[in-house]
């Protein structure tokens, strides 16, 4: 197994609809054809898997149907979008990239993107 550099933004603010997007870029040392991308969340001394997708270079990322993540790939960049976020989901979201095929296997882990989620204030009742 070999190490690989992964870059991602330090901070992202989720939209009022609970959507956060960020780019995960990896420095591919070779010509990988099969790539696995995993989003991890670190909070309260625990790391949990948020979502994961394996894709063939040149093809779209395919997350599971019930996944809160969607994404697109372009070269060595993956554009990730996480939906359905609430204030309690604020945390450090880490991009993990694995070059699965062909060998050798490469593993890269980003420094994490701190995603801040602010629940919208409920609208006051209108007199109209």
């Amino acid at each position: 197994c070999k190490a690989m550099h992964v870059a991602q933004p330090a901070v992202v603010l989720a939209s009022s609809r609970g959507i956060a997007s960020f780019v995960c870029e990896y420095a591919s040392p070779g010509k990988a054809t099969e790539v696995r991308v995993t989003v991890l969340r670190q909070a309260d001394s625990q790391v949990t898997e948020v979502c994961a997708a394996t894709y063939m270079m040149g093809n779209e990322l395919t997350f599971l149907d019930d996944s809160i993540c969607t994404g697109t790939s372009s070269g060595n960049q993956v554009n990730l979008t996480i939906q359905g976020l609430r204030a309690m989901d604020t945390g450090l979201y880490i991009c993990k990239v694995e070059l699965m095929y062909p060998p050798p296997y490469y593993l890269g882990i980003g420094n994490g993107t701190q995603i801040y989620v602010i629940d919208p204030e409920p609208c006051p009742d209108s007199d109209f």
């Epitope: 991890l40 670190q42 625990q46």
Partner: nanobody, 126 residues
Framework: EVQLVESGGGLVQPGGSLRLSCEAS????????IGWFRQAPGKEREEVSC????????NYADSVKGRFTISRDNSKNTVILQMNSLRAEDTAVYYC???????????????????WGQGTQVTVSS
């Protein structure tokens, strides 16, 4: 709240083997840096081995190199210390320690640890 629990200690003859397990209760050890320390009576506590959060890096004290092997079993939420060719001087209480580092350090062992288990006694004697 994560707690570390060691098991697998016991009495073994010189040249024998033991397999120590460090298990987490109340959480997972995924991406944690895990270390094994030992303390013999009247001696300082010393770090025996450690494994990085990714499992790609392992370190060993000179006194156990080639005899001890540390590994992760994430499916069972445990870290194993396989101890072979045991000697009388390996007799000690063995402690599992852990720390969840920033992701930028997941490929490294921790310099210090937040969490300590209660320890398991290893006695090597004929």
């Amino acid at each position: 709240e994560v707690q570390l629990v060691e098991s697998g200690g016991g009495l073994v003859q010189p040249g024998g083997s033991l397999r120590l397990s460090c298990e987490a209760s109340g959480g997972t050890l995924d991406y944690w840096s895990i270390g094994w320390f030992r303390q013999a009576p009247g001696k300082e506590r010393e770090e025996v081995s450690c494994i990085s959060g990714t499992g790609l890096r392992t370190n060993y004290a000179d006194s156990v190199k080639g005899r001890f092997t540390i590994s992760r079993d994430n499916s069972k939420n445990t870290v194993i210390l396989q101890m072979n060719s045991l000697r009388a001087e390996d007799t000690a209480v063995y402690y599992c320690t852990g720390k969840l580092l920033h992701p930028s350090l997941w490929s490294a062992c921790a310099n210090e640890y937040d969490l300590w288990g209660q320890g398991t006694q290893v006695t090597v004697s004929s």
